[in-house]
Interface confidence: medium
């Protein structure tokens, strides 16, 4: 399932994926003066099996000067209305992409490719943000965004990242250290089960929701 929207924009920040989920598409875009070869692919697709993921199709660009007399228009697939872009120049923290099953690495560059890559992300994709040069990060939470499916609608979570100019933040040394994504802390209270309800909602999906009640000593 493709994500409907672009990842959120954060002032003075860029985002990048460290690895790409299977199903991700990358447009075959060529730099000015070049075009896709006549029989070339529209996009590369991250595909794979249980043990290995890789990019299907290869992007190939050729000089527009060699164009034959028939004008060729570059069609975009109908479902690719939304353009997800990442700038290739943005340096991000390294990550061992090979350790992420079901993901493809950053595709290697192809000859005469455009300076900006246009990705079409799928549900579950995570992108990471960092401040552009000349700005520093004051982290208030995780600097990442995840595309999630909700109510049949895709949404990107909001990255908790603030980028400010160096001069404004010189009184906050060390604040640019990234924080880990907050995980739910394990419960450690000594609570007893008072009542449990065993009513179950029978559904065609066999999904059930049960509620029960705990009490804890106020501390």
């Amino acid at each position: 399932e493709l994500c409907d929207d672009d990842p959120p924009e954060i002032p003075h920040a860029t985002f990048k994926a460290m690895a790409y989920k299977e199903g991700t598409m990358l447009n075959c875009e060529c730099k000015r003066g070049f075009r896709r070869i006549k029989s070339g692919s529209l996009y590369m697709l991250c595909t794979g099996n249980s043990s290995h993921s890789s990019w299907d199709n290869q992007c190939q660009c050729t000089s527009s000067a060699t164009r034959n007399t028939t004008k060729q228009v570059t069609p975009q697939p109908e479902e690719q209305k939304e353009r997800k872009t990442t700038e290739m120049q943005s340096p991000m923290q390294p990550v061992d992409q090979a350790s992420l099953p079901g993901h493809c690495r950053e595709p290697p560059p192809w000859e005469n490719e455009a300076t900006e890559r246009i990705y079409h992300f799928v549900v579950g994709q995570m992108v990471y943000y960092q401040c552009v040069q000349g700005y520093r990060a004051l982290h208030r939470g995780p600097a990442e965004s995840v595309c999630k499916m909700t109510h049949g609608k895709t949404r990107w979570t909001q990255p908790q990242l603030i980028c400010t100019g160096e001069m404004e933040t010189s009184q906050f040394p060390g604040e640019e250290k990234p924080q880990a994504s907050p995980e739910g802390r394990p419960e450690s209270e000594t609570s007893c089960l008072v009542t449990t309800t065993d009513f179950q909602i029978q559904t065609e999906m066999a999904a059930t929701m049960e509620t029960s009640i705990f009490t804890t000593e106020y501390q």
Epitope: H151, G152, P182, M209
Partner: antibody
Framework: PGESLKISCKGS????????IGWVRQMPGKGLEWMGI????????RYSPSFQGQVTISADKSISTAYLQWSSLKASDTAMYYC?????????WGQGTLVTVSS | WMTQSPSTLSASVGDRVTITCRAS??????LAWYQQRPGRAPKLLMY???NLKSGVPSRFSGSGSGTEFTLTISSLQPDDFATYYC?????????FGPGTKVDIK
Amino acid sequence: PGESLKISCKGSGYSFTSYWIGWVRQMPGKGLEWMGIIYPGDSDTRYSPSFQGQVTISADKSISTAYLQWSSLKASDTAMYYCFRFGEGFDYWGQGTLVTVSS
Amino acid sequence: WMTQSPSTLSASVGDRVTITCRASQSIGYWLAWYQQRPGRAPKLLMYRASNLKSGVPSRFSGSGSGTEFTLTISSLQPDDFATYYCQQYNSYPFTFGPGTKVDIK
């Protein structure tokens, strides 16, 4: 009043970490109020401004259970509390937990 | 915020019933309708304004987009006497309408 309380909601029959789980309050004789939701996969949580700071929503994905917690109950917290799964609409609901706060 | 009209509706079995829900700003088609019978949990009827949830009788239908939405019951049945809520899920915080109670005339 003043006591802490934690109610729970267990989901089963679907991928618990792939759907938001949320809570709705219904005070006696009143309508439905959306309190907040949590995505158990990564504990991402969103609250209604009306409930931010008043309650805590959490989840334990290892036992497919979401929680709604108060640190200090008030009489005005007396209500029925429903959990729901957030799929195509709030598509599946718990049967509700009645919380009564009285001295 | 969401408003509903009417707040109470008296009707008879077999009647065609229409409930209106208005949003204070455009919510696209991200609207759901719920039915709640006394003492029971709410039940989803419609999602994305006009999509009928599987298992819900076809006498229920929904329409609208933007700021104005309607829920229609083509032929009211005894089981349909309940309170109906609309709810937007276009943006946080998700909000419910105040409800429309459908009772027996």
